[in-house]
């Protein structure tokens, strides 16, 4: 047994650009509080999965009102440590979630409103009894600085809090088979104290308060022999004496559920059904009342006036779970446009936009031509996240930087000769033809099929195409 302790040092804007807006204002003062959730092991678990090692809420911090025009400073914090007691061994490796919550103190109907400001998570290795470990975590534009440690509660000692120590009975040495307790050399390691009443012949324990049964015995105190009249047990080694299957150790053997909880096996482990007033993986958390504020996200707590009565959280729309800790999947409505990826950050929805799109919901088709110059008099044409240049005559390529041969396509009709020109091409027409592309025959009487030629331009002159 022991306690995980968390000390929050600061919560405020992180380094770099894009300082966050202050969470409080003169119109809407607020205060912060923190929630820590611990899970054993280094598994990548969902934020909603149970806090199997325990959870704790901090006190509320001082009321904070933003000073107009001032950048968001480090925000005033609650006093004291967050403490998460653990009853069993400290696992050594653990995952944590630390949430920063804002309690708005304006004139809300139905009491103060809570909203999640930031959530940080991590996976760490930590030996119980060691020094404080310091950490810095960032969540968006916010930065959280904190320290943590795990310490054993006497008489437990060791990196997992599984060894027990007692003061020495004699000044010189410990009892038979028992070592001195480092670093408490004046104390001796004590034998494990199994669950009260655990059969000394048929039961044993690997952790304090446990009672695990030897093969052939069952019951919470390992005092009930396994029946050999029925050979229907689905698991365990065959018994040499009876030829029947004797149940091997199952997840509910020794009843891991504390405080009168009843154990039922699940495909992967066990599940405890807790009596009123208790909850947690092993019914180890007790005495939570509505006064402790167990309902998150503005959930309404009903019942639970005293530690022996259960509470129920009535969740506001958008939240679910026994403590309103789970957020409904809002991204399933696909609010992001143009193929953007939806991210539910808890306090807000965010869209990660595809190239060529921007805006909170990827609703803006970026100006593909912004900052894109088409050379040599070309004009930029937008199109679905990419740009292209419509080049002036004589130029080609993606940015109109390549000089094109305007005569390559043989544009001059009826044997006219083509000449490249800085402003395009010029056709020198064969006798009897005229026009920009020598496309019009000249009639023998001097009239042409064209409207009258512009002044100064005679039929048969080279026609410049602009």
């Amino acid at each position: 047994a022991g306690v995980f302790e968390l000390q929050i040092h600061s919560f405020g804007p992180g380094p770099g650009p894009g300082a966050p807006r202050s969470p409080c204002s003169a119109r809407l003062p607020c205060r912060l509080f923190f929630r820590v959730c611990l899970k054993p092991g280094l598994s990548e678990e969902a934020a909603e999965s149970p806090c199997a090692l325990g959870a704790a809420l901090s006190a509320r911090g001082p009321v904070y009102t933003e000073q107009p025009g001032a950048p968001a400073p480090d925000l005033p914090l609650p006093d004291g440590l967050l403490q998460v007691p653990f009853r069993d061994a400290w696992p050594g490796t653990f995952s944590f979630i630390i949430e920063t919550w804002r309690e708005e103190l304006g004139d809300q109907i139905g009491g103060p409103a809570w909203s999640l400001l930031a959530r940080v998570a991590g996976r760490r290795r930590l030996a119980a009894g060691g020094p404080w470990a310091r950490d810095i975590q960032r969540a968006g534009a916010w930065e959280l600085r904190f320290s943590y440690r795990a310490r054993c509660e006497p008489p437990a000692v060791g990196t997992a809090c599984t060894r027990l120590c007692r003061p020495r009975s004699a000044p010189s040495r410990c009892g038979p088979g028992l070592r001195p307790c480092a670093p408490l050399e004046d104390e001796c390691e004590a034998p494990l104290v199994c669950r009260a009443g655990c059969s000394p012949e048929h039961g044993f324990c690997e952790q304090p308060g446990e009672c695990r049964c030897l093969e052939g015995w069952t019951g919470p105190l390992c005092t009930v022999p396994v029946s050999t009249s029925s050979c229907l047990s689905p698991r365990g080694p065959s018994s040499a004496t009876t030829g029947c299957l004797v149940p091997g150790p199952g997840p509910c053997d020794g009843n891991p559920c504390a405080n009168g909880g009843s154990c039922s096996e699940t495909p992967r482990s066990f599940e405890c059904t807790c009596p009123r007033g208790f909850y947690g993986l092993r019914c180890e958390v007790s005495g939570v009342t509505c006064a402790d504020g167990p309902c998150f996200n503005g959930g309404l707590c009903v019942g639970g006036a005293d530690p022996d009565s259960a509470y129920i959280c009535h969740c506001p729309p958008g939240f679910q779970g026994s403590n309103c800790e789970k957020r409904v999947d809002r991204c399933s409505l696909q609010p992001c446009r143009n193929g953007g990826l939806c991210l539910d950050l808890g306090h807000a929805l965010r869209c990660r936009c595809r190239a060529g799109f921007a805006g909170p919901r990827c609703e803006h088709d970026l100006d593909d031509c912004a900052g894109r110059a088409c050379a040599n008099g070309g004009t930029c044409v937008e199109g679905g996240g990419a740009h292209r240049c419509s080049c002036a005559l004589g130029f080609g390529g993606r940015d109109c930087r390549e000089r094109a041969d305007p005569c390559a396509a043989r544009p001059c009709a009826h044997g006219g000769r083509c000449y490249a020109h800085f402003s395009g091409l010029v056709c020198a027409c064969a006798p009897g033809y005229m026009g920009a592309r020598c496309e019009f025959p000249v009639h023998p009487d001097g009239a042409s099929a064209l409207p009258a030629a512009p002044p100064g331009l005679r039929p048969g002159d080279p026609q410049r195409y602009l």
Epitope: G318, R330, L333, Q334, P335, C336, R337, N338, G340, L349, P360, R361, C362, E363
Partner: nanobody
Framework: EVQLVESGGGEVQPGGSLRLSCAAS????????MGWYRQAPGKQRELVAG???????KYAESVKGRFTISRDNAKNTVYLQMSSLRAEDTAVYYC??????????????WGQGTLVTVKP
């Protein structure tokens, strides 16, 4: 502030029909996405049908061919026409909307829910 007001829930026999409506009001600049979720006792809340941000319609597999979502943009209202109702459709139906507010930021809103009960 934005309000979503649902109506049309009630009790109906298997095979029957109901029409839910949800009207959005308040400081709305535009409605980006809007639809219906439902939550049966002891179950997670799930999307039933909705208009996505791109304006397309989306349906849960279990209601395709039986439920139809429609909208009246002028009234900022969505409707859910539910036909061939089954016992497993019994749930509280919640309206949800992703709204661009007049101040130009987006917020996600929920209605208070309307109960649909399908029983013989």
């Amino acid at each position: 502030e934005v309000q979503l007001v649902e109506s049309g829930g009630g009790e109906v026999q298997p095979g029957g029909s109901l029409r839910l409506s949800c009207a959005a009001s308040g400081s709305i600049f535009s409605i980006n996405a809007m639809g219906w979720y439902r939550q049966a006792p002891g179950k997670q809340r799930e999307l039933v049908a909705g208009f996505t941000g791109d304006g397309s319609t989306k349906y849960a597999e279990s209601v395709k061919g039986r439920f139809t979502i429609s909208r009246d943009n002028a009234k900022n209202t969505v409707y859910l026409q539910m036909s061939s109702l089954r016992a497993e459709d019994t749930a509280v139906y919640y309206c949800a909307a992703d709204v661009q507010l007049l101040q130009s930021d987006y917020e996600f809103y929920w209605g208070q829910g309307t109960l649909v009960t399908v029983k013989p």
